[in-house]
């Protein structure tokens, strides 16, 4: 895990896009893949386990001249909490990776509250890059316009 971070809490939620598509995790050939698709109203949505961490942001990094704190998350399918959503900075994809011990930096995302209903996930290892939706897949999106809908997600309590 990242130095200086401490676990605050964890909770399950379902994850859906701005356009009300569901993020789900499907087992294919022994590996989980991430799907973004329309799910029926009666269909039970897949859940993610969100682990919330507090991370100090020293004055030297904050740009404000004062110390700050960020709220970060990592996310696992409830079906298998030993794998994490992972930002692949090589091909700008979002993958599920199994970890032996603690999650690497690529599995941490800074939480942005975008509105009363929506959040965004900024890659810890790629500032200015967010989890987004591209062609019905999760991908890493360099967001110039932070209000862009394709980086907004709704977390629904179970």
């Amino acid at each position: 895990s990242i130095q200086g971070t401490s676990l605050l809490t964890q909770s399950p939620a379902s994850l859906s896009t701005y356009n009300d598509q569901s993020v789900s995790f499907v087992l294919e050939n022994g590996c989980y893949v991430i799907n973004v698709d329309d799910s029926g109203k009666d269909q039970e949505q897949d859940q993610v386990l969100l682990r919330y961490y507090e991370s100090p942001c020293p004055a030297s990094q904050s740009g404000d001249g004062v110390d700050g704190k960020k709220l970060m998350v990592n996310m696992s399918p409830i079906k298998d909490t030993d794998i994490w959503l992972h930002a692949n900075d090589k091909d700008y994809s979002v993958e599920l990776q199994r970890g032996d011990v603690s999650p690497p930096e690529q599995a941490f995302f800074v939480l942005h509250k975008k509105s009363s209903d929506f959040v965004s996930f900024e890659c810890k290892n790629l500032p200015g890059t967010y989890i987004g939706v591209k062609d019905n897949q999760l991908a890493l999106v360099e967001e110039k316009d932070e209000s862009c809908n394709n980086i907004m997600f709704k977390l629904s309590k179970i």
Partner: antibody, heavy 121, light 107 residues
Framework: QVQLQESGPGLVKPSETLSLTCTVS????????VHWIRQPPGKGLEWIGV???????GYNSALMSRVTISKDTSKSQVSLKLSSVTAADTAVYYC???????????????WGQGTLVTVSS | DIQMTQSPSSVSASVGDRVTITCLAS??????LAWYQQKPGKSPKLLIY???RLADGVPSRFSGSGSGTDFTLTISSLQPEDFATYYC?????????FGQGTKVEIK
């Protein structure tokens, strides 16, 4: 260091619009949300609304039809407007800053000293 | 909107006493609860955030517990400077509602 300072008229007439400004220093409005909270004399705290780091707003549902929060980033100011005021809007008005970058989950760590607004003719 | 119910509304206690204040949310808010202390004529001060985390500079005699809907603020050994009003606030979803407050008075 981080500071928030409320300013505006201390007396507003009924049916008029209450306008207050929160001038901030020591942090960026693009990173932290700023909230308005009020406290009628001798009573508890009431959350009015928030201007989030990304620019969106959220309001107390009971006040939503009368309240507007906006910002002037160049002046490091967040403004509150409350229309059609009555005596029930008499209160100390506070602005406060989020504890965390980009979200309100951690509460409000920095507060202004508050300004008393009396609604009376 | 989420309603926050604090109890008791006031408590009389002596220096050295253990004081417990509870806060009940009308629906689950996870761990997203803060506690504030307010003295007359002053702005509120953040004591506890994320239900259990002590804010910077707050004495360790203050502690928070709970998650979901039931939360507690405990002052393990009341000091003269602790006589004040305490508020809980939920930060799970907007509007970010406060409890009605608990006044801790000198017995």
């Amino acid at each position: 260091q981080v500071q928030l300072q409320e300013s505006g008229p201390g007396l507003v007439k009924p049916s008029e619009t209450l306008s207050l400004t929160c001038t901030v220093s020591g942090f960026s409005l693009s990173k932290y949300g700023v909230h308005w909270i009020r406290q009628p004399p001798g009573k508890g705290l009431e959350w009015i609304g928030v201007l989030r780091a990304g620019g969106s707003t959220g309001y107390n549902s009971a006040l939503m039809s009368r309240v507007t929060i906006s910002k002037d980033t160049s002046k490091s100011q967040v403004s509150l407007k409350l229309s059609s005021v009555t005596a029930a809007d008499t209160a100390v008005y506070y602005c406060a800053r989020d504890h965390y970058y980009y979200s309100s989950y951690g509460g409000f760590v920095y507060w202004g000293q508050g300004t008393l607004v009396t609604v009376s003719s | 909107d989420i309603q926050m119910t604090q109890s008791p509304s006031s408590v009389s206690a002596s220096v050295g006493d253990r004081v417990t204040i509870t806060c009940l949310a009308s629906q689950t808010i996870g761990a997203w609860l803060a506690w504030y202390q307010q003295k007359p004529g002053k702005s509120p001060k953040l004591l506890i955030y994320a239900a259990t985390r002590l804010a910077d500079g707050v004495p360790s005699r203050f502690s928070g517990s709970g998650s979901g809907t039931d939360f507690t603020l405990t002052i393990s050994s009341l000091q003269p400077e602790d006589f004040a009003t305490y508020y809980c606030q939920q930060l799970d979803s907007s509007p970010y509602t406060f409890g009605q407050g608990t006044k801790v008075e000198i017995k």
